[in-house]
């Protein structure tokens, strides 16, 4: 079997996080969200080729389909495996809070 | 907002559970598995529109950033919320054992 | 490289108030708060509060409130400090810092003002 | 308001000793704690973020673990420019609370 973390594509061409830096305008958070107003949002991107980084037997089998039926089954698909959480100053009634999101920021990736 | 159910790109068009019938042989394991010989794969294809089945604010971002910078962050993809387990009859050294995976059959779909 | 550069120190008498401005440069000064935390002589941090530039919403301690007011001014990218009021016991360093960022993150901050307060 | 509370409050090392230095928050602070260092006169410096994240530019002999309440700084071996005190923080909440600090001392 192929190496599960060597992407057969070539260099960064494969399923991985990268990280986008946003403005809160972008996000669509500009009113609830204070602070911080810029933020490094990491995600999961790439291609999901035989073999690379399967998730589980579901992406196996996704594959195997794929190659048979390209047209009905789609490739897996390259998906956060785990979440960093994230901390966001928001208004509230009565002032402002720390408030903490755990599913905003992709931590390491799969495909699925 | 929208109905997080509700396709806005008509009926089946979007991210939902489809089964697929598939041989073993299709799925690569006729020299492992004995029994059963053909499979209901169930698996989740779809668009995933904005708003649609979002599983949590890290595919609203998504969608978000893939409406900006198509080119750089994919739209939220259809993948599994949840799995069936399935029982495979296998071949072992000893003889023949059943098997449960809980892995294999997607139960319900989210938009990640 | 991101920078706050705090005014000058200052001599108070009890009962006076006093204004500490910090200037920031090298970011965007409305992306993030300003907090303001100080330190007595041989004491620990004590953090005072808490202003994002993009709005002007505030955050005070407890113990603080009514006797001091934090303010922004995004033309000239400077947070300013203004404690009334004041007693010995406010003989301090105060500093002013960035954050908190979406670690939680508290990661730059002034060279610290020093403000006494002594009849 | 979330109480944190540092052990021990001084420590004397050598150069080349591995110092663990304590932090407990009062309920749970997920992993929203910081590390900083400060030196006689000067800024504190921030060493560790979330817990356990390196602040960029900091060496690799301090590390920091734990999440919930309980917190710990390590330095893996002590360096001269180590001596110092060093203080957590969490940013949970509002208030932004401290540790009453910990001084690191030459034995």
């Known amino acids: 079997a192929r190496n599960g973390d060597r992407c057969p594509l070539g260099p960064g061409r494969c399923c991985r996080l990268h990280t986008v830096h946003a403005s809160l305008e972008d996000l669509g958070w500009a009113d609830w969200v204070l602070s911080p107003r810029e933020v490094q949002v990491t995600m999961c991107i790439g291609a999901c080729p035989s073999q690379f980084r399967e998730a589980n037997m579901h992406a196996q089998i996704k594959m195997n389909l794929h190659r048979l039926k390209p047209d009905t089954v789609p490739a897996p698909c390259c998906v956060p495996a785990s979440y960093n959480p994230m901390v966001l100053i928001q208004k509230t009634d009565t002032g402002v809070s720390l408030q903490t999101y755990d599913d905003l920021l992709a931590k390491d990736c799969h495909c699925v | 907002a929208r109905n997080g159910d509700r396709c806005p790109l008509g009926p089946g068009r979007c991210c939902r559970l489809h089964t697929v019938h598939a041989s073993l042989e299709d799925l690569g394991w006729a020299d492992w598995v004995l029994s059963p010989r053909e499979v209901q794969v169930t698996m989740c294809i779809g668009a995933c529109p904005s708003q649609f089945r979002e599983a949590n604010m890290h595919a609203q971002i998504k969608m978000n950033l893939h409406r900006l910078k198509p080119d750089t962050v994919p739209a939220p993809c259809c993948v599994p919320a949840s799995y069936n387990p399935m029982v495979l009859i296998q071949k072992t050294d000893t003889g023949v054992s059943l098997q449960t995976y809980d892995d294999l059959l997607a139960k319900d779909c989210h938009c990640v | 490289q991101v920078q706050l550069v705090q005014s000058g120190a200052e001599v108070k008498k009890p009962g006076a108030s006093v204004k500490v401005s910090c200037k920031a440069s090298?970011?965007?000064?409305?992306?993030?708060?300003i907090n303001w935390v100080r330190q007595a002589p041989g004491q620990g941090l004590e953090w005072m509060g808490w202003?994002?530039?993009?709005?002007?919403?505030?955050n005070y301690a407890q113990k603080l409130q009514g006797r001091v007011t934090m303010t922004t001014d995004t033309s000239t990218s400077t947070a300013y400090m203004e404690l009334r009021s004041l007693r010995s016991d406010d003989t301090a360093v105060y500093y002013c810092?960035?954050?908190?960022?979406?670690?939680?993150?508290?990661?730059?901050w002034g060279q610290g003002t020093m403000v006494t307060v002594s009849s | 308001d979330i109480q944190m509370t540092q052990s021990p409050s001084s420590v004397s090392a050598s150069v080349g000793d591995r110092v663990t230095i304590t932090c407990r928050a009062s309920?749970?602070?997920?992993?929203?704690l910081a590390w900083y260092q400060q030196k006689p006169g000067k800024a504190p410096k921030l060493l560790i973020y979330?817990?356990?994240s390196l602040q960029s530019g900091v060496p690799s002999r301090f590390s920091g673990s734990g999440s919930g309440t309980d917190f710990t700084l390590t330095i893996s071996s002590l360096q001269p420019e180590d001596f110092a005190t060093y203080y957590c923080?969490?940013?949970?909440?509002?208030?932004?609370?401290f540790g009453g600090g910990t001084k690191v001392e030459i034995k």
């Open positions: 979330a817990a356990s």
């Open positions: 923080q969490q940013a949970n909440s509002f208030p932004i609370t």
């Open positions: 810092a960035r954050g908190p960022g979406q670690y939680a993150d508290v990661d730059v």
């Open positions: 090298g970011y965007t000064f409305t992306s993030y708060g």
């Open positions: 309920q749970g602070i997920s992993s929203w």
């Open positions: 202003i994002t530039a993009y709005s002007g919403d505030t």
